[in-house]
């Protein structure tokens, strides 16, 4: 039975040209995390595999940095980076847990972080 929950940074804002950390955290389970995928709806940004380490998609190599931890840092943000980002935790023996983050990249200098929230 899957008992875990994914906590994410929820809805977040950042300034154009700046950087942001996408972070998910799996809690309430003793399952072993073996891989984490970072994705958008139609493309994969990065994979962190326990055995193979990090893989960053060539499309994002210049602007994406692995970490901190299992998170992902997006740099040199543009308004086109606005949208949904998904963390997909592959675990043993539970299976997969997924979380959603919505990033809004703002033109102005008023960019506030949204509240943290949980996805069961």
């Amino acid at each position: 039975m899957m008992t875990g929950t994914i906590e994410t940074t929820g809805n977040i804002s950042a300034e154009k040209g700046g950087s942001i950390i996408l972070q998910c955290h799996l809690s309430s389970t003793t399952a072993q995390v073996t891989q984490v995928n970072w994705e958008q709806q139609d493309q994969l940004l990065a994979i962190c595999n326990a055995d193979l380490g990090w893989h960053i998609s060539p499309s994002f190599k210049d602007r994406v940095a692995p970490g901190p931890g299992l998170g992902l840092t997006l740099q040199s943000l543009t308004v086109n980076d606005t949208g949904e980002y998904f963390c997909i935790y592959h675990t043993y023996p539970d299976g997969t847990y997924t979380g959603r983050i919505f990033l809004e990249v703002l033109e102005s200098s008023v960019a506030e972080h949204g509240a943290r929230f949980q996805i069961p």
Partner: antibody, heavy 121, light 107 residues
Framework: QVQLQQSGAEVKKPGASVKVSCKAS????????IEWVKQAPGQGLEWIGV????????NYNEKFKGRATITADKSTSTAYMELSSLRSEDTAVYFC??????????????WGQGTTVTVSA | DIVMTQSPSSLSASVGDRVTITCKAS??????VAWYQQKPGKAPKLLIY???YRYSGVPSRFSGSGSGTDFTLTISSLQPEDFATYYC?????????FGQGTKVEIK
Amino acid sequence: QVQLQQSGAEVKKPGASVKVSCKASGYAFTNYLIEWVKQAPGQGLEWIGVINPGSGGNNYNEKFKGRATITADKSTSTAYMELSSLRSEDTAVYFCARRGDKYGSAWFAYWGQGTTVTVSA
Amino acid sequence: DIVMTQSPSSLSASVGDRVTITCKASQDVSTAVAWYQQKPGKAPKLLIYSASYRYSGVPSRFSGSGSGTDFTLTISSLQPEDFATYYCQQHYSSPRTFGQGTKVEIK
């Protein structure tokens, strides 16, 4: 349990259009992406496109852009794939499929039974 | 588009045999590969996702491995119900693409 029920077989003339439906049940329709896949007779699988039923946003294989239109009706939990300007090479079985996890990667865990479309003069 | 090339295109095997099907991607797809089984007149069934993760309810005789460009589906001891066509698929980028299929037939 999750079910994707597709509409029945269609026979169409070249140049016509066909609209295939895929009615979802057993889960929250707006939370999961729906994909469409083509399989020509004796051939492999070819991805057509995807829709997010919650937002209506979609993405297409370039090969089908302009001829395929994928839509979703939240009120009936039904996804549609319309193919226009039909030609003989569109004769195929068309499947709808759902990703395995909410927000999940594009592996397809649940499939409709398939709809056979025959294009013949 | 990423091209997925499967081999062999068909093979003959007996019940109890160990069967290996390979899939080669035209570019690095990390571990973003799924495997499906399809029987005539039926929809495909998901066996493996992310190269090596067995989907819920799939028998343990099915296993997947590989990363980068080379991937393998192994059936450790072929059962009568395993005679079917198997497809690999990359879930790395759009458009999603499939291998051409490997038909596993009874020897």
